[in-house]
């Protein structure tokens, strides 16, 4: 007797973080024996979508013409062959940005910092939120979460860095979110350029690459120091 059907591969183009109103295509790739593909969204009351395979039958396309809150979430796909349904794919997390107004990102005391000193990036939202994310451009592991304890709402989160090295230099943005759906993020803050001076080593430009690629040493998440900020937020690493 044959073993379970191999699981399909699930991915999104142009990516899994999509701005409100933009289009996204979800692809599910199975085998040439596939007769039907099914996309399931976590905690949905019914299959999210079902599609016939595209020739040569080894994949299916699920189109989202305009990204809205409805589509943000965690997906898996399956394919059906003559012997039954496959194992589920690994999950795909589809995140929508633009759900809330953009926060403000600033550097204290200044975005120009000397190597070895300390700097704190401050993400502030107009309305109280319970999750803040700091993202460094072109980092393989860009997300640093600060999430409030017990759902307490905050207007800001602090991301301290100490001691600063050339690795910390670069462009940052932050997002805010509500805990009831971490698949819905605010518009991104305006970019903040953190410039590290006085370093003996020349800062190397980080190569442009997608979030899914392996991390190099310059792409490690910022390691915060000291105690949890007074804002009542807890640190979570992605």
């Amino acid at each position: 007797q044959a073993g379970p059907l191999p699981k399909p591969t699930l991915w999104a183009e142009p990516g899994s973080v999509i701005s409100w109103g933009n289009s996204v295509t979800i692809w599910c790739q199975g085998t040439l024996e596939a007769r039907e593909y099914r996309l399931d969204k976590e905690e949905s009351p019914a299959p999210w979508d079902r599609q016939n395979p595209l020739e040569p039958k080894n994949k299916a396309r699920f189109s989202i013409p305009s990204m809205t809150e409805d589509y943000a979430g965690r997906y898996r796909c399956y394919y059906r062959s003559p012997v039954g349904w496959s194992q589920p794919s690994d999950p795909l997390e589809l995140v929508m940005t633009g759900a809330y107004s953009k926060p403000t990102l600033s550097a204290l005391p200044s975005p120009l910092v000397t190597s070895g000193k300390s700097v704190t990036l401050l993400c502030q939202s107009r309305s109280p939120m319970d999750t803040f994310l700091l993202i460094k451009e072109r980092a393989a592991h860009p997300l640093l979460h600060l999430r409030s304890e017990h759902g307490a709402q905050q207007h800001q989160a602090e991301f301290p860095m100490s001691p600063v090295t050339s690795v910390h230099g670069g462009t940052y943005r932050c997002f805010s979110s509500h805990g009831f759906s971490h698949y819905l993020l605010s518009h991104p803050s305006d970019p903040l350029e953190l410039i590290v001076s006085g370093s003996l080593e020349d800062p190397r430009p980080s190569p442009t690459r997608s979030v899914s690629t392996a991390a190099g040493p310059e792409d490690q998440p910022l390691m915060p120091t000291g105690s949890v900020p007074h804002s009542g937020l807890r640190r979570h690493w992605e």
Epitope: S44, P45, A46, P47, D49, R50, D70, G73, W85
Partner: antibody
Framework: QVQLVESGGGVVQPGRSLRLSCAAS????????IHWVRQAPGKGLEWVAV????????YYADSVKGRFTISRDNSKNTLYLQMNSLRAEDTAVYYC???????????????WGQGTLVTVSS | DAVVTQESALTTSPGETVTLTCRSS?????????ANWVQEKPDHLFTGLIG???NRVPGVPARFSGSLIGDKAALTITGAQTEDEAIYFC?????????FGGGTKVTVL
Amino acid sequence: QVQLVESGGGVVQPGRSLRLSCAASGFTFSTYGIHWVRQAPGKGLEWVAVIWFDGSNKYYADSVKGRFTISRDNSKNTLYLQMNSLRAEDTAVYYCARDVISMVRGVPFDYWGQGTLVTVSS
Amino acid sequence: DAVVTQESALTTSPGETVTLTCRSSTGAVTTSNYANWVQEKPDHLFTGLIGGINNRVPGVPARFSGSLIGDKAALTITGAQTEDEAIYFCALWYSNHWVFGGGTKVTVL
């Protein structure tokens, strides 16, 4: 046109069993999920259970979990509800209602049957 | 267990706009509750109106629309007709089960 016809209702004593059927026509039964919903005399609607198009997923209301079983036979275009350990509070008109092909295509509870009355009484 | 609450009754006049709401005891109604609206006419004739991902059942007039207003789901009848007199039930999804509200009796005088 879409038709859902329930049958199998009647009077039954507490603790006994009953099996309801829902015969579907006018649409491709095997591509749709189907619900059971009930309405006690003079009351509102209470959702009972749903089964996906291929039977792969089944969900139940807490009030019937462990006592009722939803199933389907796609070759016969028929939905079933096996009701065991019946209680007086299960007395209601039981309706089957069509679910969706998928969430992005269709609306849950779009078509309903006329219902079959189940009375649980000693 | 979640309780879904609706207005017990609303009265409107032909041509007027009426909004029915659906509140969840667990907090704000969100898109993840997939709010659904069902109409009951006399003799227990049930028809789905709106649900899923903002879908309207084919054949349902465009004057019926669903939305989220504040922390509640809403059904708006824009330009009510006498034939819209009925009981309207909302249903909300909670991860693995549906819960119906108690229904709103709409009278069109």
